[in-house]
């Protein structure tokens, strides 16, 4: 058993049929010695008396809020949560496996630039009685500070018969140099509590590997005289690291109709303009990627050909 | 401690082309190592990230763009002085700081060159003949060093009398290639910045 936060404890259980469970001793936080009784959750049934209560925690029915009283007055609470371990593996029931970029990916993180600011998100089908707490650091043995905000519900989607909820959190490394060469990864730890179930999820990454620039901005078209070609120009996104001559981007320019199966014109360039062939009912799209370290491409920025 | 804005004309900067070739060569070599050594811990997640130039050179700090010198987190206290007569400095007005930056890059290359050559000598003794260093990568390191053209004491190639542990050597190769790729990215950024300034 260990303390998650004040008055909240996590009991780690090997989860299999007829498992013996864990013996837990609860102590009432009071100077009183006599006349103390214990109850669980909203029940008025007295579970025991005395300053300490010993219980055998085997299942979720044994978890919950234990309260010690004296003469009708509440003295203190202890909330017991269960963390299940099945076949030596901690349960991952609360969050959905996003399976990208690999299986067992529960947390996904992205950074728009090298400032040390990043966003992580996760998915769940659970809508109520759900709380998250996020911690982060650079390295684990001698951790350096990363400050994370509160996790918030950022999107709701309908997937078949199920509703899917996306939560996200923003974090900022306390003293980040955009030009630094990372040798210790960022560690992100998410504590998830659903009703009386506790789970924890972790992710470890270098900022350089989770970079995904915002799409290029200010796309403009200029038709070329006596030609089917148009010159398309754009600018670096505002959120990208500066100076741009140091943090350079490379771009992919594509002309395509509405369907992905349609024919297209595609060209890659390090410049902020390119010449392409525009077709009726097609769109010109441009996306960006770090020129020197190939992490993710940005989403497309698009303008219609006409 | 930082790069000044007054630097050579764009077309006058011979190191940019070499630095692009360097990043390409080390990226290709790393990809080859990851494929060939698929049963070894050779991915970014699996290896320890070591920097053989740590406390010996200060490339990131010495080559910091002017715009980032306002960022306290970028200003480390490390200072290293180097010889200042490189041929990439196409302008006589080029400041001492830029010379410091380019000579720091030169020292990085020299250190990695020695390590890679020593490692290759060991890998050539491996009866499995599983992996060798790409001669093109070694040649590209050499070309960039020549373009930088700094006078520097030659570092003797390390020779080892004991029988090499080929497993350890291959893991060290992965560690070295990952670190060198990161440094090559920094070098490319620096050259691009200098070329544009």
């Amino acid at each position: 058993i260990w303390e998650l936060k004040k008055d909240v404890y996590v009991v780690e259980l090997d989860w299999y049929p007829d498992a013996p469970g864990e013996m837990v001793v609860l102590t009432c936080d009071t100077p009183e010695e006599d006349g103390i009784t214990w109850t669980l959750d909203q029940s008025s049934e007295v579970l025991g008396s005395g300053k300490t209560l010993t219980i055998q925690v085997k299942e979720f029915g044994d978890a919950g809020q234990y309260t010690c009283h004296k003469g009708g007055e509440v003295l203190s609470h202890s909330l017991l949560l269960l963390h299940k371990k099945e076949d030596g593996i901690w349960s991952t029931d609360i969050l959905k496996d996003q399976k990208e970029p690999k299986n067992k990916t529960f947390l996904r993180c992205e950074a728009k630039n090298y400032s040390g600011r990043f966003t992580c998100w996760w998915l769940t089908t659970i809508s109520t009685d759900l709380t998250f707490s996020v911690k982060s650091s650079r390295g684990s043995s001698d951790p350096q500070g990363v400050t994370c905000g509160a996790a918030t519900l950022s999107a709701e989607r309908v997937r078949g018969d199920n509703k899917e909820y996306e939560y996200s959190v923003e974090c900022q490394e306390d003293s980040a140099c955009p030009a630094a060469e990372e040798s210790l990864p960022i560690e992100v730890m998410v504590d998830a509590v659903h009703k009386l179930k506790y789970e924890n999820y972790t992710s470890s990454f270098f900022i350089r590997d989770i970079i995904k620039p915002d799409p290029p901005k200010n796309l403009q078209l200029k038709p070329l005289k006596n030609s089917r070609q148009v010159e398309v120009s754009w600018e670096y996104p505002d959120t990208w690291s500066t100076p741009h001559s140091y943090f350079s981007l490379t771009f992919c320019v594509q002309v395509q109709g509405k369907s992905k199966r349609e024919k297209k014109d595609r060209v890659f360039t390090d410049k902020t303009s390119a010449t392409v062939i525009c077709r009726k009912n097609a769109s010109i799209s441009v996306r960006a990627q770090d020129r020197y370290y190939s992490s993710s491409w940005s989403e497309w920025a698009s303008v219609p050909c006409s | 401690r930082n790069l000044p804005v007054a630097t050579p004309d764009p077309g006058m900067f011979p190191c940019l082309h070499h630095s692009q070739n360097l990043l390409r060569a080390v990226s290709n070599m790393l990809q080859k190592a990851r494929q060939t050594l698929e049963f070894y811990p050779c991915t970014s997640e699996e290896i320890d990230h070591e920097d053989i130039t740590k406390d010996k050179t200060s490339t990131v700090e010495a080559c910091l763009p002017l715009e980032l010198t306002k960022n306290e987190s970028c200003l480390n206290s490390r200072e290293t002085s180097f010889i200042t007569n490189g041929s990439c400095l196409a302008s006589r007005k080029t400041s001492f700081m830029m010379a410091l930056c380019l000579s720091s890059i030169y020292e990085d290359l020299k250190m990695y060159q020695v390590e890679f050559k020593t490692m290759n000598a060991k890998l050539l003794m491996d009866p499995k003949r599983q992996i060798f260093l790409d001669q093109n990568m070694l040649a590209v390191i050499d070309e960039l060093m020549q373009a930088l053209n700094f006078n520097s004491e030659t570092v003797p190639q390390k020779s080892s009398l004991e029988e090499p542990d080929f497993y350890k050597t291959k893991i060290k190769l992965c560690i070295l290639l990952h670190a060198f790729r990161i440094r090559a990215v920094t070098i490319d950024r620096v050259m691009s910045y200098l070329n544009a300034s």
Partner: antibody
Framework: QVQLVQSGAEVKKPGSSVKVSCKAS????????LHWVRQAPGQGLEWMGW????????EYAPKFQGRVTITADESTSTAYMELSSLRSEDTAVYAC???????????WGQGTLVTVSS | DIVMTQSPLSLPVTPGEPASISCRAS??????LHWYQQKPGQAPRQLIA???QSISGVPSRFSGSGSGTDFTLTISSLQPEDFATYYC?????????FGQGTKVEIK
């Protein structure tokens, strides 16, 4: 199986014109750009131009501008390349090639040898 | 027009050995570079798109690298069926242009 089948070899006099055909099978004809590339004996490849069969848009290499005409007939899934004012240096194998991507080629025709000789 | 220069023009190689062909552009073309293989009397066959993207059905021994002005096609271990002429082609701008070709011959 996508295939491009070209018309047979031709022998032409200098100053005359030649029209080579390229019939596509497999896949929808208008879903691809169609190019013409030539190769003189013992020489390399030389791009001549492209057509979008969907709308008849064309683009020609400056070297052939005014002398080459590329057309397409959607009803027969056939593209044509006509080269006029032939000279002996136009003796080459002319090949059609196609792709959904405009600027490179994934399927090629077998080539048509055009010999220009007096 | 962008001029593509291949080297060497002729490359004698022992079967089983690796081979590398270089292609240089007269100006920077990013990764807009494609490789083709042509055997005598046959149409060219696409090997690599956009400098390094492998093409479905092409053996993994063929790989491409490069960006800007310098590109390389590498055949890791030459098989008898690989003896042919190889062409690079730029798609950065029109007119599309090819290298002169490199003939890979049996040593």
């Amino acid at each position: 199986q996508v295939q491009l089948v070209q018309s047979g070899a031709e022998v032409k006099k200098p100053g005359s014109s030649v029209k080579v055909s390229c019939k596509a099978s497999g896949g929808t004809f208008s879903d691809y750009y169609l190019h013409w590339v030539r190769q003189a004996p013992g020489q390399g490849l030389e791009w001549m131009g492209w057509i979008d069969p969907e709308n008849g848009d064309t683009e020609y290499a400056p070297k052939f501008q005014g002398r080459v005409t590329i057309t397409a007939d959607e009803s027969t899934s056939t593209a044509y390349m006509e080269l006029s004012s032939l000279r002996s240096e136009d003796t080459a194998v002319y090949a059609c090639a196609r792709n959904k991507e405009l600027r490179y080629f994934d399927v090629w025709g077998q080539g048509t040898l055009v010999t220009v000789s007096s | 027009d962008i001029v593509m220069t291949q080297s060497p023009l002729s490359l004698p190689v022992t079967p089983g050995e690796p081979a590398s062909i270089s292609c240089r552009a007269s100006q920077s073309i990013s990764i807009n570079l494609h490789w083709y293989q042509q055997k005598p009397g046959q149409a060219p066959r696409q090997l690599i798109a956009f400098a390094s993207q492998s093409i479905s059905g092409v053996p993994s021994r063929f790989s491409g690298s490069g960006s800007g002005t310098d590109f390389t096609l590498t055949i890791s271990s030459l098989q008898p069926e690989d003896f042919a002429t190889y062409y690079c082609q730029q798609s950065n701008s029109f007119p599309l242009t090819f290298g002169q070709g490199t003939k890979v011959e049996i040593k």
